[in-house]
Amino acid sequence: AAQPNNSLMLQTSKENHALASSSLCMDEKQITQNYSKVLAEVNTSWPVKMATNAVLCCPPIALRNLIIITWEIILRGQPSCTKAYKKETNETKETNCTDERITWVSRPDQNSDLQIRTVAITHDGYYRCIMVTPDGNFHRGYHLQVLVTPEVTLFQNRNRTAVCKAVAGKPAAHISWIPEGDCATKQEYWSNGTVTVKSTCHWEVHNVSTVTCHVSHLTGNKSLYIELLPVPGAKKSAKL
């Protein structure tokens, strides 16, 4: 059966409205299709940064071979949305689709790709292109994970104790310290799916004068350092 593998190609470009745009389409590596009518479904997990534009692609099948192209969109807490194009009548139809930022890239008879303009947290979900041919269906599915960059702050709150916070990230950031101290980490979950991570560390050893908080996140990593003073130091703030 048609079984493309899951190696990926990620393209990034700048659109003229200055939003970063990423397109996740199949890498051109795939196991040859035999003549079975059971055409395998391929699913990809795809992390995409919030506020960028995203383009999702269908399998590489020429329009002349198609009967119907359907995008099925399943977002949390919403009814399934479908966008369909029927070649014979050259008509498009939408069912339960309310988000105007999710559209065909252009006319579906010219380009079957789906685009999400200015990705938001609410776009977390499952997107599937279904290409109906006379001999069976080809599928390409995406589990879209929207990434939110946390705001990172580092401050000293009392003698030889520092607090590093990664606020409202998605998914949760990971905080580590150099050098290691006596640390406690808490996570606070918000209703929009973001997480604030707070790590509080204390250093008894007096020869430790500078400490570094390292925040690891899928959107990028950030390091901040602070000098341990007998009095609280100035607050530092940064975006990843």
Epitope: C57, E88, D135, F138
Partner: antibody, heavy 119, light 110 residues
């Protein structure tokens, strides 16, 4: 297995027409687009057009429009390519080829039919 | 229409060596992350045989000595190492809506 068998060689006079057949077996005939390609002696491959047996759609190379007609007979799983107003430069081997869905690649070809145009 | 230009027109290679054929398209044949470029081998008296599809995918049953690469407008077919029975004509092809072939490259084994 998937197989395309073409009709035998033809000799035609200039101005005549020729109709080459391509019989398909081993798959659902109406499900796959069929292309026609020709190759003059010692020359390269030249795409002529295609027919989609599912809906009878055709698309021809501009060079052959008005002279070529592609048809299909679903009862015999056969596609036909008819070329009219033949001239000596139409002397060539004519191939049918089936297009596979994934990537629009042509994985199966007929054995070829030699058409000779000579007075 | 997209025009495909192959080079070189002919190529003589010793067994065990590498043969490289290039194909340049007059405009991009890549869309939605896929390059609709295929490579065929044709031996005298035979129909063409598919070697590579979508620029870099090896067709089932084709030896791994054959490989394809490229995207956009520039594509390459590589045979490494070349064997005696690789003597043939090789064609690049763009196949998506309107279909075109390169003019062919004749590969001879010394």
């Amino acid at each position: 297995q998937v197989q395309l068998v073409q009709s035998g060689a033809e000799v035609k006079k200039p101005g005549a027409s020729v109709k080459v057949s391509c019989k398909a077996s081993g798959y659902t005939f109406t499900s796959y687009v069929m292309h026609w390609v020709r190759q003059a002696p010692g020359q390269g491959l030249e795409w002529m057009g295609y027919i989609n047996p599912y809906n009878d759609d055709t698309n021809y190379n501009e060079k052959f429009k008005g002279r070529v007609t592609m048809t299909r007979d679903t009862s015999t799983s056969t596609v036909y390519m008819e070329l009219s107003s033949l001239r000596s430069e139409d002397t060539a081997v004519y191939y049918c080829a089936r297009e596979d869905y994934y990537g629009s690649r042509w994985g199966t070809w007929g054995q070829g039919t030699l058409v000779t145009v000579s007075s | 229409d997209i025009v495909l230009t192959q080079s070189p027109a002919s190529l003589a290679v010793s067994p065990g060596q590498r043969a490289t054929i290039t194909c340049r398209a007059s405009k991009s044949v890549s869309t939605s992350g896929y390059s609709y470029m295929h490579w065929y081998q044709q031996k005298p008296g035979q129909p063409p045989k598919l070697l590579i599809y979508l620029a870099s995918n090896l067709e089932s049953g084709v030896p791994a000595r054959f490989s394809g690469s490229g995207s956009g407008t520039d594509f390459t077919l590589t045979i490494n190492p070349v064997e005696a029975n690789d003597t043939a004509n090789y064609y690049c092809q763009h196949s998506h809506e309107l279909d075109t072939f390169g003019q062919g490259t004749k590969v001879e084994i010394k």
